[in-house]
């Protein structure tokens, strides 16, 4: 009789999971001296513990903690660049700018970006066929639970000016429900950062307006001038150019605005 | 087939510097991944790590140490040398080395058959 | 430094018995621990890592257990080769710190 299994309505755990966990886990160390202490065999006891055995709709902060231990890892602080909705300018922006660090920058960020995982409450497997979808189904999913832990202490950690990539191209460019609106900008700490500085990211080539000035970004000017941080706001007009600028600041193209 | 093999001088003095050499087989410096570390063990007693060195030349010291270690390798002759300063007598013991691989952090599969040093005036 | 601590020095045992040695952390280390077997005269032999990993070619009557501060190595059935000095180490963080021992011994 084959055995009932919840059918989820978001996409199973990604294939090969665990071998990939431990095959980047393995690439990091390699990439970054500073965590070649790192075991990634314990790295990965810790990442499955977290969600095997555990309803996929219970999981909490706590169940990632060994995890976050082992994970631990020190960038500097006034190099953080957070980003909502524009993950792939960001990660081209940090693999040019090596000083800078997002989140997929770290350890466990590498681990996890664009993987899904899940597993069954009472067995010891994983669930390829489908995991909780964050809105139809459940908020303390396995995923959606590990990105609000990393994100909230990728957050806390931040000093000085905090760089945020936003995506001008979105109808809500600053969205109060995204893990940035949600979690990273209300665990800034005031007696650290100075200044969130925000890059709007213009997506039409000949798009000249001062997205600085729209509705959601002055609600996220609002939100962070309450928490006692400074504000302030730049329209990137042409992403392309701007990259070329960060590969090569002495082009003489550079100095206009981008 | 993985094989180290530790050499040293066997005898030296007060204030010498102690210098060693891990010679190894099976196993290349020149590949992504791989480390030797150097331990030590005072005769009946118990084991003390001292330092590692990976392929792409990053070094670890014990920060006990430190200051006198000095940890190196000569990629195409399959060798890694430890220098230890201004030996004393509580330098005296069997001294190990053994490979060490990248996603294990610092576990130590394959060990040499040690080298004994006394340090006596 | 994360201090190792290997209760017993020495445990008394007899072949065929199963026996566990104990490894306490100063530090929580999660589960980065290694356990070696080392024999008069030779070198130590690398049997379990990140505590309940068995090394290849190790015998499966060699177990590795524990997490956080609290480790053990067990073996289910002793035998007469298996007389030796086991040590746990920490692969945690640098400095690595081994325990100081505990010599299994025949009663």
């Known amino acids: 009789v084959p055995r009932w299994r919840q059918q989820w309505s978001g996409p199973g755990t990604t294939k090969r999971f665990p071998e990939t966990v431990l095959a980047r886990c393995v690439k990091y160390t390699e990439i970054h001296p500073e965590m070649r202490h790192v075991d990634c065999q314990s790295v990965w006891d810790a990442f499955k513990g977290a969600f095997i055995s555990k309803h996929p709709c219970n999981i909490t902060e706590e169940d990632y903690q060994p995890l976050m231990k082992l994970g631990t890892q020190t960038v500097p602080c006034n190099k953080i660049l957070l980003w909502s909705r524009i993950k792939d300018l960001a990660h081209q922006f940090t693999q040019v700018q090596r000083d800078m660090f997002t989140l997929e920058d770290t350890l466990l960020g590498y681990l996890a970006d664009d993987l899904t995982w899940c597993g069954e409450f009472n067995t010891s497997k994983i669930n390829y066929q489908s995991c909780p979808d964050w809105r139809k189904d459940c908020s303390n999913n396995p995923v959606s639970v590990f990105w609000k832990t990393v994100s909230r202490r990728f957050a806390e950690a931040a000093c000085d000016v905090v760089h945020v990539m936003l995506n001008g191209s979105r109808s809500k460019i600053f969205d109060k429900n995204s893990t940035f609106g949600s979690v990273e900008v209300h665990n800034l700490q005031p007696e650290k950062v100075q200044t969130l500085e925000a890059w709007v990211i213009h997506g039409g080539r000949e798009d000249s307006r001062d997205l600085c000035q729209d509705p959601t970004i002055k609600e996220l000017e609002s939100i962070i001038s309450k928490r006692n941080i400074q504000f302030s706001c730049k329209n990137i007009y042409r992403p392309d150019k701007f990259l070329q600028c960060v590969k090569n600041p002495e082009d003489s193209s550079c100095t206009s605005e981008i | 087939q993985v094989t180290l093999k530790e050499s040293g001088p066997g005898i030296l003095q007060p204030s010498q510097t102690l210098s060693l050499t891990c010679s190894f087989s099976?196993?290349?410096?020149?590949?992504?991944?791989?480390?030797v570390g150097w331990i030590r063990q005072p005769s009946g007693k118990g084991l003390e790590w001292l330092a590692h060195?990976?392929?792409?030349?990053?070094?670890r010291y014990n920060p006990a140490l430190k200051s006198r270690l000095t940890i190196s390798k000569d990629t195409s002759s399959n060798q890694v040398f430890l220098k230890i300063a201004s030996v004393d007598t509580a330098d005296t013991a069997t001294y190990y080395c053994a490979r060490i691989e990248l996603g294990r952090s610092y576990v130590m599969d394959y060990w040499g058959q040690g080298t004994t040093v006394t340090v006596s005036s | 430094d994360i201090v190792m601590t290997q209760s017993h020095k020495f445990m008394s045992t007899s072949v065929g018995d199963r026996v566990s040695i104990s490894c306490k952390a100063s530090?929580?280390?999660?589960?980065?621990v290694a356990w070696f077997q080392q024999k008069p005269g030779q070198s130590p032999k690398l049997l379990i890592y990140s505590a309940s990993y068995r090394y290849t070619g190790v015998p499966d009557r060699f177990t590795g257990s524990g997490s956080g501060t609290d480790f053990t190595f067990t073996i289910s059935s002793v035998q007469a080769e298996d007389l030796a000095v086991y040590y746990c180490q920490q692969h945690y963080t640098i400095p690595l710190t081994f325990g100081a021992g505990t010599k299994l011994e025949l009663k």
């Open positions: 530090q929580d280390v999660i589960t980065s």
């Open positions: 060195i990976w392929w792409d030349d990053d070094k």
């Open positions: 099976g196993l290349s410096l020149s590949t992504s991944g791989k480390g």
